[in-house]
């Protein structure tokens, strides 16, 4: 008889990414005997929760919990039953809940309580539901990208762990309600709040991170809409031939539009607004989102926020990817340089509604917003973060790495389950022939 080698036992972990516009569930898996290896944890499956983000259930907290049931049922299927009890389950909420917590902390608590109530009903090892800080969201996204791309440590053929020569990758995340930029830097931080020191696999990393609340794609679109209502009788970023009725209550209920909110307005009033396909006015409208007037540090990105010069290569994911991918794939426009990105944004903003629909059939939902989205991404990267043509050449727009979605969720789980040791693995792997 010969021994049949059984496949290594797998462990699983579940993270619910409760974003501002929707919630996604990610199930991760890894071989139980290789927990400390880098890049060994991968995505097993995922599930999109139907409906809006949990912050949209402020008036109906129970619904926030119940909305997760379908995906949790999928988790019961996707994770082998004998692993359920040992599978950690986390829920992390981001900027949508940060905003709700600012405006209505009681509702925010009620939503998290309801979600917790639902998650504790399941046989997984539930380890809490909480709101991540912007700093955590940025850093965990950076950890995810670099972990998946195996930038922290590498396993050499001689059986020794070594740190690869290539540096780490910066991470840029564009969510629904906030955007994050995170990268390794040698410059000491002039603002302590933006510096995070990490020790991973025995290596020390000094990381700059900042999260801009209200600069996520959905909130930017709301702010531009509020500005258009305030300054124009039309929306320069919407295509000509497109018009819709805007409910004022929807526009002004967000704390992000408070600056444009009239002193008195009828929240139930509907205002008709039409697009005008005006790239130049649209650019002006988007420019109004950034302030460069004062900087209390030696250098800033925008709004008086300290930022060292961008350094190294970057991965831009989530809505950065979706926006650029639309320009590249749906519109067939080149976006390899900043100049091309700007030209692509202008191209989209010049299109009429009929032209856009003909060009991109069957994508009605957000079609009218791609002009504003493209203008914002272009301005955020060039004027906001200070990418020049050379630095922009080092930016890759990608939503996945190693078949795993890039975002804060994996980094969060790796951190909370101690899957990234602070010190390098003590045991040698394999044989040293030297």
């Amino acid at each position: 008889t010969r021994d049949i080698r059984e496949p290594p036992a797998l462990k699983y972990g579940i993270v619910l990414d409760a974003g501002s516009s929707h919630t996604s569930m990610f199930i991760y898996k890894w071989p139980a005997d290789k927990e400390n290896d880098t890049g060994i944890v991968g995505q097993h499956s995922s599930c999109d929760v139907p409906g809006g983000g949990i912050s949209s259930y402020a008036d109906n907290p129970s619904g926030a919990g119940q909305s997760l049931v379908g995906c949790l049922e999928q988790a019961l299927r996707d994770v082998p039953k004998e692993r359920h009890a040992g599978t950690p389950l986390y829920l992390g909420a981001t900027a949508g809940m940060r905003l709700l917590n600012l405006t209505n902390p009681e509702a925010s608590t009620s939503v998290l309580t309801a979600v917790t109530h639902t998650l504790t009903q399941y046989p997984f090892d539930f380890r809490g539901a909480r709101i991540l800080s912007g700093q955590e969201e940025g850093v965990f996204g950076w950890v995810t990208a670099n972990y998946l791309l195996e930038n922290f440590i590498k396993y050499g053929w001689v059986g020794r762990w070594f740190r690869p020569r290539k540096g780490t990758l910066g991470a840029m995340d564009l969510g629904g309600a906030s955007t994050q930029i995170t990268f390794e830097t040698t410059s000491p931080a002039e603002d302590r709040a933006s510096e995070v020191q990490l020790r991973l696999y025995g290596q020390h990393y000094r990381v700059y991170t900042h999260s801009f609340l209200c600069y996520g794609r959905d909130q930017v679109l709301q702010r531009l809409l509020a500005s258009a209502l305030q300054t124009h009788s039309f929306h320069p970023c919407w295509p000509r031939g497109f018009s819709t009725h805007v409910l004022l209550g929807d526009v002004y209920q967000s704390p992000c539009t408070v600056a444009q909110r009239p002193q008195t307005f009828n929240s139930s009033a509907r205002v008709s607004l039409s697009g005008s396909s005006d790239p130049h006015l649209c650019r002006d409208l988007v420019s109004g989102l950034f302030s460069f007037s004062s900087c209390p540090f030696s250098r800033c990105s925008f709004n008086g926020v300290f930022q060292p010069p961008v350094a190294g290569n970057f991965i831009a994911f989530s809505a950065f990817f979706y926006t650029v991918n639309f320009l590249r794939t749906s519109m067939g426009l080149p976006v390899a340089t900043l100049q091309q990105l700007e030209a692509a944004a202008v191209n989209v903003c010049n299109q009429t509604w009929a032209q856009l629909q003909a060009r991109v059939p069957g994508q009605q939902a957000h079609l009218a917003d791609y002009c504003a989205g493209a203008m914002f991404v272009q301005q955020l990267l060039s004027r906001g973060y200070g990418f020049d043509e050379r630095a922009f050449g080092g930016v890759i727009f990608q939503k996945k790495a190693a078949d795993t979605a890039v975002g804060w969720a994996l980094g969060y789980m790796l951190n909370l389950t101690n899957l990234i040791p602070a010190d390098p693995p003590g045991l040698r792997k394999g044989t040293d022939f030297s």
């Epitope: 639902t118 399941y122 046989p123």
Partner: antibody
């Protein structure tokens, strides 16, 4: 402690419909779903369908699809089960049962049931 | 469609151990729940998640589940345990609850 209270016994003619109510007393349907289970005389339990009251989300057993409608009125914490095109084999005790969102505690609160008799 | 099969009846001597089985295709991969129903009464949950007891259910009741068979075990059976017992499982594929046909437990002596 939440209790479920159902409407009284009904006698119906074949081909007609019956609507049974189930009210949560001492609490609401907050974070719970409500299932309807029936039991014909001397027979076993048979699941008919469920509703998540605050979402209005329903699921039905294939056998009853198109003949059963489950609704809920959140304001009164009452769930309803309506069964149409009644036939004699629908004579049964109809139970409403509360289930937690994750099925972890399955049906933890039941009412005593409503007897529906279908007879010409 | 998924089905659960139970023996029609099981007898046990007073004070002895009763075992009621519930078989279904790969039932060990699903969670099984057990209900006790006495004549003229609504069912009562006695076991959830294969082997967990809700508060108020005596320790004499236990459950196990693997392979194609789930088992409800009642040790030191008492006259008051005489009832119909139903196993149930949630069929995730079809999003529906499935009940076994029920087992009548008779306590002799």
């Amino acid at each position: 402690q939440v209790q479920l209270v159902q409407s009284g016994a009904e006698v119906k003619k074949p081909g007609s419909s019956v609507k049974v109510s189930c009210k949560a007393s001492g609490g609401t349907f907050d974070s719970y779903a409500v299932s309807w289970v029936r039991q014909a005389p001397g027979q076993g339990l048979e699941w008919m369908g469920r509703i998540v009251p605050w979402l209005g989300h329903t699921q039905y057993a294939q056998k009853f699809q198109g003949r059963v409608t489950i609704t809920a009125d959140e304001s009164t914490s009452t769930a309803y089960m309506e069964l149409s095109s009644l036939r004699s084999e629908d004579t049964a005790v109809y139970y409403c049962a509360r289930e937690s969102p994750g099925y972890r505690y399955s049906f933890d609160v039941w009412d005593q049931g409503t007897l529906v008799t279908v007879s010409s | 469609s998924y089905e659960l099969t139970q023996p029609l009846s099981v007898s046990v001597a007073l004070g002895q151990t009763a075992r009621i089985t519930c078989s279904g295709d790969a039932i060990g991969e699903k969670y099984v729940y057990w209900y006790q129903q006495k004549p003229g009464q609504a069912p009562v949950l006695v076991i959830y998640d294969d082997n967990n007891r809700p508060s108020g259910i005596p320790e004499r009741f236990s459950g196990s589940n693997s392979g194609n068979t789930a088992t409800l075990t009642i040790s030191r059976a008492q006259a008051g345990d005489e009832a119909d017992y139903y196993c149930a499982s949630y069929d995730l594929q079809q999003a529906r609850w499935v009940f076994g046909g029920g087992t009548k437990l008779t306590v002799l002596g």
